[in-house]
């Protein structure tokens, strides 16, 4: 019987060009985590295998960093990064636990990057 639960960072937002940490935490189970997969719309971003460590997909290698912990850091965000992300915990003997995070990447604030007016 699967007793575990996954807590995630839920719905999050970040600015274009910035970075964000995607975090999931598996609790309430003594199952052994054999691998954690990070996926976006059926695309595999990265895995952290208990035996063989972190492996990042070549498509994301320049913008994805492992950690902290079993989390994933996305860098140089673009508006196209907006969407659902899934952490998939493969465990023994329980099986698979999945957590969902929705990331919204926002255009940089006008205050920071907009036109600046000088008072004469």
């Amino acid at each position: 019987m699967m007793t575990g639960t996954i807590e995630t960072t839920g719905n999050i937002s970040a600015e274009k060009g910035g970075s964000i940490i995607l975090q999931c935490h598996l609790s309430s189970t003594t199952a052994q985590v054999t691998q954690v997969n990070w996926e976006q719309q059926d695309q595999l971003l990265a895995i952290c295998n208990a035996d063989l460590g972190w492996h990042i997909s070549p498509s994301f290698k320049d913008r994805v960093a492992p950690g902290p912990g079993l989390g994933l850091t996305l860098q140089s965000l673009t508006v196209n990064d907006t969407g659902e992300y899934f952490c998939i915990y493969h465990t023994y003997p329980d099986g698979t636990y999945t957590g969902r995070i929705f990331l919204e990447v926002l255009e940089s604030s006008v205050a920071e990057h907009g036109a600046r007016f000088q008072i004469p």
Epitope: I47, L52, W54
Partner: nanobody, 118 residues
Framework: EVQLVESGGGLVQAGGSLRLSCAAS????????MGWFRQAPGKEREFVSA????????NYADSVKGRFTISADNAKNTVYLQMNSLKPEDTAVYYC???????????WGQGTQVTVSS
């Protein structure tokens, strides 16, 4: 049927080199992480090195960094472990292993003996 067949082990003097090979069959090579582990007499099996995604990712245990190099030939479905500057403490049975990118399920080879004499 998944098969991992190691070769290249043997007896070598300290400071020497060996190249281990692991020929894989029965699965799509690019969908897996390939790795090497080793087990010395009376000790637990330990991670040595791993490679994935057509060689774009490699990991090494601290004890072998700078001395061992992992590589893969995707056309031959073979992973290699080039071992240089070998030390007596590298003596062990070396096992090839694989883990599926999608779900982590794994397979092991039968192992090849490496003995480093001082």
């Amino acid at each position: 049927e998944v098969q991992l067949v190691e070769s290249g082990g043997g007896l070598v003097q300290a400071g020497g080199s060996l190249r281990l090979s692991c020929a894989a069959s029965g699965f799509t090579f690019s969908d897996y992480v390939m790795g090497w582990f080793r087990q010395a007499p009376g000790k637990e099996r330990e991670f040595v090195s791993a490679i994935s995604w057509s060689g774009t990712n490699t990991n090494y245990a601290d004890s072998v960094k700078g001395r061992f190099t992992i590589s893969a030939d995707n056309a031959k479905n073979t992973v290699y472990l080039q071992m240089n500057s070998l030390k007596p403490e590298d003596t062990a049975v070396y096992y090839c292993a694989t883990r599926a990118l999608r779900d982590g399920r794994g397979y092991w080879g039968q192992g090849t003996q490496v003995t480093v004499s001082s």
